[in-house]
């Protein structure tokens, strides 16, 4: 049996229904069997877990997703073995295997793989700060969302009106969410907002930076 699945990965928003398309061509016999299974990201195919079987004219959903899985066509004997997964969770992200068996059609292995990503908006990020906050010093502002798929990009902005910082004194990394401020001055003080964004939405946090005069060293 030759199984056909989309070549491009599938993305479905959190809470929506994912349709994992799987089709095939074979003269369906009484021994026809379909199995859908799931592998977590980064795990080998050998560690797949069954989530649905169809055999002897009957459908058997199984495992932790059993209440949420069904077939677009039941019975799946018309060439369409497409799986529907409702109310998708972040833990549904991974690889799905569609395997069709129909002895004596052994021309190919009857296996198709579909990668599913559940799209999750960024959670409210956590803003933190470390380093020297005295004039002339350097500090790092960090921003990180614990949730979000695809991984959010981070953008720092300073709120309010202020003099333009000198070039190179404010460098941010959109991937790590880090903003490095160098050569701090009193005018560097203020509120900084980090916005975490992906295709599902955005979330933000704010942090107030207070730059102080360096403490005067005394000679005894």
């Amino acid at each position: 049996v030759e199984v056909k699945v989309p070549t491009e990965p599938l993305s479905t928003p959190l809470g929506k229904t994912a349709e994992l398309t799987c089709t095939y061509s074979t003269s369906v016999g009484d021994s026809f069997a379909l199995e859908w299974s799931f592998v977590q990201p980064g795990k080998p195919i050998s560690e797949s877990h069954p989530i649905l079987y169809f055999t002897n004219g009957h459908l058997y959903p199984t495992g932790s997703k059993s209440k949420r899985v069904s077939l677009l066509q039941n019975p799946p004997t018309v060439g369409v073995a497409t799986l529907k997964l409702t109310d998708v969770h972040p833990s549904d992200t991974g690889t799905y295997l569609c395997q069709v068996n129909n002895p004596p059609d052994f021309y190919t292995n009857g296996l198709g793989l579909i990668n599913l990503t559940v799209l999750v908006p960024p959670s409210n990020p956590l803003c933190s700060q470390s380093g020297q906050t005295s004039v002339g010093g350097s500090t790092a502002l960090r921003c990180s969302s614990s949730e979000g798929a695809p991984k959010p990009v981070y953008n720092w902005v300073r709120l309010g009106t202020f003099p333009t910082p000198s070039p190179g004194s404010m460098v941010q990394d959109e991937v790590s969410g880090q903003l490095i401020l160098t050569n701090l001055s009193l005018t560097s003080s203020g509120t900084y907002r980090c916005v975490a964004t992906n295709q599902m939405g955005s979330a933000s946090c704010e942090l107030t930076l207070s730059v102080t005069e360096p403490s005067q060293g005394r000679v005894a």
């Epitope: 030759e2 056909k4 089709t23 061509s25 074979t26 003269s27 369906v28 016999g29 009484d30 021994s31 026809f32 002897n56 004219g57 019975p75 004997t77 018309v78 060439g79 369409v80 004596p104 059609d105 021309y107």
Partner: antibody, heavy 118, light 107 residues
């Protein structure tokens, strides 16, 4: 040599019923998916029903669904098509055909003519 | 349902001619296409399946090509026995449908 021989065609009034038969020989009937394909006079081919090797799965196009029933008796190497609520547009030569491992039709019978007319 | 469209509907040719018939599917059917030959008053005969595979006994002057939505049946050198009507059929998802046919007649 593979042989498929249809019988049971004839003249029937609209709304009437007819049962077609197909006697198979020359191959292992119980291992083969089978279909009925029809051809209206002067027209093209239309698949009308299929059945799996042991009879567990049957399929029909919308044009005949609910009116036609395909069945088989593997002990007798026979295929059947029960046709109810017949319409004028069901007038055609009905062929019995064996399916390959993929659903193309590798052997055909000579056909039997069904005429639906008042 | 997948629609199959053949062209031309009729083709006039002479013995020895190279003849090409086209079949288009309304959606991707990969290589799941069969071709049949039918002579008047006779049952169709399988010529090609999986777009390009010839069953045993089919003369090598017949060949098939294509994948996706566009397919061709070619007769490299038309013989007297080849004047007939030719049909394509997809063997992908149910319902399996046929093209309307191409009649190859003597010029």
């Amino acid at each position: 040599e593979v042989q498929l021989v249809e019988s049971g065609g004839g003249l029937v009034k609209p709304g009437g019923s007819l049962r077609l038969s197909c006697a198979a020989s020359g191959f292992t009937f119980s291992n083969s998916g089978m279909s009925w394909v029809r051809q209206a006079p002067g027209k093209g081919l239309e698949w009308v029903a299929s059945i799996s090797d042991g009879g567990l799965y049957t399929h029909y196009p919308d044009s005949v669904k609910g009116r036609f029933t395909i069945s088989r008796d593997n002990a007798k190497s026979s295929l059947y098509l029960q046709m109810n609520s017949l319409r004028a547009e069901d007038t055609a030569v009905y062929y019995c055909a064996r399916q390959g491992v993929r659903p193309f039709f590798d052997y055909w019978g000579q056909g039997t003519l069904v005429t639906v007319s008042s | 349902d997948i629609q199959m469209t053949q062209s031309p509907s009729t083709l006039s040719a002479s013995v020895g001619d190279r003849v090409t018939i086209t079949c288009r599917a309304s959606e991707n059917i990969y290589s799941y296409l069969a071709w049949y030959q039918q002579k008047p008053g006779k049952a169709p005969k399988l010529l090609i399946y999986n777009a390009e595979t010839l069953p045993e006994g089919v003369p090598s002057r017949f060949s098939g090509s294509g994948s996706g939505t566009e397919f061709t049946l070619t007769i490299s050198s038309l013989q007297p026995d080849d004047f007939a009507t030719y049909y394509c059929q997809h063997h992908y998802v149910i319902p399996w449908t046929f093209g309307q046919g191409t009649k190859v007649e003597i010029k």
